[in-house]
Interface confidence: low
């Protein structure tokens, strides 16, 4: 067990703070909830503290919860590939570029670390080149979320990892909006981290609303499990 992994044996409170600017539309989001890495479970509620969110909530899911991949359930035989927990409590910087097909892109930078007993994900998001009447700024996405695989590889040069995956957002007209994610994680501290063999995270997310919440918000339930490395066959992935 890595030193960081010991911090995730129970339920951990989570705080998410995002400041965003998409095509000049500025907004802030605060999120609170908890994570249980034993089950790879996240429960979070996000509120736009600046009024109405200028982009659809589903476009921010990866930035919020795929940001705290330290809550992913790594089976016993894969624990030596869990970079995310090994970087704790000092945490990691997570940077992403998200390309929305035939539309604009988000660039995000986050610091994910423990502040006291709470796992905090502080994010800045800058979005440019979006069409005002496109699927994103035109709010044409359905309020739901598909399952995805998130592919992880070691980045030995930077003592971190590189991650990429493609999100499929459902559009109201029945088509799909693709969002290509390119991600890089680097540890904040100087301590040793686990550099993984190639593997993936399998994610399932459910979006809902709080009937008592008047503000623009999103309620998220998510399960994430690591996979792709079989018992005693690590040499196949080297």
């Amino acid at each position: 067990m890595s030193k960081g992994e010991e911090l995730f044996t129970g339920v951990v409170p989570i705080l998410v703070e995002l400041d965003g600017d998409v095509n000049g539309h500025k907004f802030s989001v605060s999120g609170e909830g908890e994570g249980d890495a034993t089950y790879g479970k996240l429960t979070l509620k996000f509120i736009c503290t600046t009024g109405k969110l200028p982009v659809p909530w589903p476009t921010l899911v990866t930035t919020f919860s795929y940001g705290v991949q330290c809550f992913s359930r790594y089976p016993d035989h894969m624990k030596q590939h869990d970079f995310f927990k090994s970087a704790m409590p000092e945490g990691y910087v997570q940077e992403r570029t998200i390309f929305f097909k035939d539309d604009g892109n988000y660039k995000t930078r986050a610091e994910v670390k423990f502040e006291g007993d709470t796992l905090v994900n502080r994010i800045e998001l800058k979005g440019i080149d979006f069409k005002e009447d496109g699927n994103i700024l035109g709010h044409k996405l359905e309020y739901n979320y598909n399952s995805h695989n998130v592919y992880i590889m070691a980045d030995k040069q930077k003592n971190g990892i590189k991650v990429n995956f493609k999100i499929r957002h459902n559009i109201e007209d029945g088509s799909v909006q693709l969002a290509d994610h390119y991600q890089q994680n680097t540890p904040i501290g100087d301590g040793p981290v686990l550099l993984p063999d190639n593997h993936y995270l399998s994610t399932q997310s459910a979006l809902s609303k709080d009937p008592n919440e008047k503000r623009d918000h999103m309620v998220l339930l998510e399960f994430v499990t690591a996979a792709g490395i079989t018992h005693g066959m690590d040499e196949l992935y080297k």
Partner: nanobody
């Protein structure tokens, strides 16, 4: 803005930014600086709501940002000034909470006219 001027290396200056038509007790107030021909660089910011402060690495321990809500004014106390601090200093305001690191100038909605600070060796 006011309080700029010329000073010897190692000296101090205090910049003031009195906001009119904008309430400093909400959102974020920041100081930026710009050398002609270069991008504006974030120096310090203060979250008006809770007083949380943020500093660029180059000024940590030397500069202090503070606010006086009653006077609707934000200050930048600059100690141990170095020739590299020579620049035009701008005060900026955003109706949103401060980003946790000093993000690009596009974050801010309101800007002052700028005040020149010159530090000679």
């Amino acid at each position: 803005e006011s309080g700029g001027g010329s000073v010897q290396a190692g000296g101090s200056l205090r910049l003031s930014c009195a906001a009119s038509g904008y309430t400093v007790s909400r959102g974020c107030m920041a100081w930026f600086r710009q050398v002609p021909g270069k991008e504006r660089e974030g120096v310090a910011a203060i979250n008006s709501g809770d007083g949380t402060t943020y500093y660029a690495d180059s000024v940590k321990g030397r500069f202090t940002i503070s606010q006086d809500n009653a006077k609707n004014t934000v200050y930048l106390q600059m100690n141990s000034l170095e020739p590299e601090d020579t620049s035009i200093y701008y005060c900026a305001a955003s109706r949103l909470r401060c980003p946790w690191n000093l993000v690009s100038a596009s974050w801010y909605d309101f800007w002052g006219q700028g005040t020149q600070v010159t530090v000679s060796s």
